[in-house]
C-alpha cells in the first residue's frame, strides 16, 4: 500500500517518462540560479511537501535532488537566511522503510546526516546548516531544479 505522497511521486515520474524528450538546457532560464550543472529556483511562499513537488512540475522541473555531501554544501551556501527550511525531493518510503528520492533511487546513508526520525509521512528539508526530517504536512519553502545538459540530438531508428 503506497502512501498518497508516494503515489504522487510515482505519477509525476511516470508522466515525465511518457513525455517526449526535450532538447537539453544550455543556460539557466531567467530568475534561476546556476549551481554547477543545475539550475535552482527558490520559492517565495510556503507549502506542504506534496504541493511543493507539484508546483515544481508546473515549472517543468523537480524538487531538488542532491547527489552527495559536496552538492549539499554548495546548495546550502546559496541559502541566505539562517532559519529558513526548504523541501527537497526526498521522502520516507513506508513500503521500503527507507529514504527515497523522487527519481526512485534510495538515499546513500553517507550522503546526508539527517536530524530527526525516519518514519511515515516524513520528508526532508534543508537549511543553511543542516538536513532535517519533518512532517510532510509542514508548510515551508522549497527548491526546484532543472538539469543543465548539452544538446544531444536523439537518434531514432529508421521506421
Amino acid at each position: 500500500q503506497k502512501s498518497s505522497i508516494e503515489k504522487c511521486s510515482v505519477d509525476i515520474q511516470q508522466s515525465r517518462n511518457k513525455t517526449t524528450e526535450r532538447p537539453g538546457l544550455l543556460n539557466c532560464p531567467i530568475y534561476w540560479q546556476q549551481l554547477r550543472e543545475k539550475c535552482l529556483l527558490f520559492s517565495h511562499t510556503v507549502n506542504p511537501w506534496n504541493n511543493s513537488l507539484a508546483d515544481c512540475s508546473t515549472k517543468e522541473s523537480s524538487l531538488l535532488l542532491i547527489r552527495d555531501k559536496d552538492e549539499l554544501i554548495h546548495t546550502q551556501n546559496l541559502i541566505r537566511d539562517k532559519a529558513i527550511l526548504f523541501w527537497i525531493g526526498l521522502n520516507f518510503s513506508l513500503s521500503e522503510k527507507n529514504w527515497k528520492w523522487i527519481n526512485g533511487s534510495f538515499l546513500n546513508s553517507n550522503d546526508l546526516e539527517i536530524r530527526g526520525d525516519a518514519k511515515e509521512n516524513s520528508c526532508i528539508s534543508i537549511s543553511q546548516t543542516s538536513v532535517y526530517s519533518e512532517y510532510c504536512s509542514t508548510e515551508i519553502r522549497w527548491i526546484c531544479q532543472k538539469e543543465l545538459t548539452p544538446v544531444r540530438n536523439k537518434v531514432y531508428p529508421d521506421s
Partner: antibody
C-alpha cells in the same frame, strides 16, 4: 480585473487587537500568496508576513511573530490579518498585497489600505 | 536585515525632465529588486521587478537598472502623472525590506 478590497478604518486602545480583512476578486484566490505590508504616517513600508491561501501556511516577519496571525477563508476569497497587544506605534495604514509569483518576492496588486489608529 | 537607502529623499523636477533615483543595498542582493510608485492616499503600484523588467502596462519611459548593491530607476521624460513617491524593495532574503522613499515634486 484583479481587486483587493479591505475593511474600513479602525480606532483601537493600546493593548487591544485589530482584525483587518482583504477580499479578493478577479482571479483564483488560492493561486496566489497574500502578504501584509504596513505604512506608519509619513513613513516607509514594512513587510509583516504572508499566507498561502491554498494551504493556509504562514510565514511572519520575526518582528511581529508573537503578535500577528494571518488566516483565510477560501469560501469567500478573503484573507485576514490580526494584530494583538496594540501599541501607539502600530498606528499605520495596513495593506494586503498579492505576491506576483511563487518564486519572486514582488507584489503586483495591493488593497486600498486600512487605517488603524491606536490611541488611548 | 538588508537596508535599502534611497537618494535623493526629495527631488524637484519639471514635466519633460529626465530623472534618476538611486537605491543602495547594504549587502549584495543580485537583481532581486522591485520599484513601486505611490501617490498620496493610494496603495503602491508595481513598476519594475528583477531590477529592470517593466510590469505589464507600465509606460516605457520608466526603466530600471543595476545589480549587486546599486540600482537606479530612470524616468526618461516626466509626465504630470509621474509626480509621486517611489520606493525600492529587495527580496534577496525572505525578510523583504523597502527603501525610505523618494518624493518627486513639481518644480
Amino acid at each position: 480585473q484583479v481587486q483587493l478590497v479591505q475593511s474600513g478604518a479602525e480606532v483601537k486602545k493600546p493593548g487591544a487587537s485589530v482584525k483587518v480583512s482583504c477580499k479578493a476578486s478577479g482571479y483564483s484566490f488560492t493561486g496566489y500568496t497574500m502578504n501584509w505590508v504596513r505604512q506608519a504616517p509619513g513613513q516607509g513600508l514594512e513587510w509583516m508576513g504572508l499566507i498561502n491561501p491554498s494551504s493556509g501556511g504562514t510565514y511572519y516577519n520575526q518582528k511581529f511573530k508573537d503578535r500577528v496571525t494571518m488566516t483565510r477563508d477560501t469560501s469567500i476569497s478573503t484573507a485576514y490579518m490580526e494584530l494583538s497587544r496594540l501599541r501607539s506605534d502600530d498606528t499605520a495604514v495596513y495593506y494586503c498585497a498579492r505576491l506576483g509569483d511563487n518564486y519572486r518576492g514582488y507584489f503586483d496588486y495591493w488593497g486600498q489600505g486600512t487605517t488603524v489608529t491606536v490611541s488611548s | 536585515d538588508i537596508q535599502l537607502t534611497q537618494s535623493p529623499s526629495f527631488l524637484s523636477a519639471s514635466v519633460g525632465d529626465r530623472v534618476t533615483i538611486t537605491c543602495r543595498a547594504s549587502q549584495d542582493v543580485g537583481t532581486a529588486v522591485v520599484w513601486y510608485q505611490q501617490k498620496p492616499g493610494k496603495a503602491p503600484k508595481l513598476l519594475i521587478d528583477w531590477a529592470s523588467i517593466r510590469h505589464t502596462g507600465v509606460p516605457s519611459r520608466f526603466s530600471g537598472s543595476g545589480s549587486g548593491t546599486e540600482f537606479t530607476l530612470t524616468i526618461s521624460s516626466l509626465q504630470p502623472e509621474d509626480f509621486a513617491t517611489y520606493y525600492c524593495q529587495q527580496y534577496s532574503t525572505y525578510l523583504y525590506t523597502f527603501g525610505g522613499g523618494t518624493k518627486l515634486e513639481i518644480k
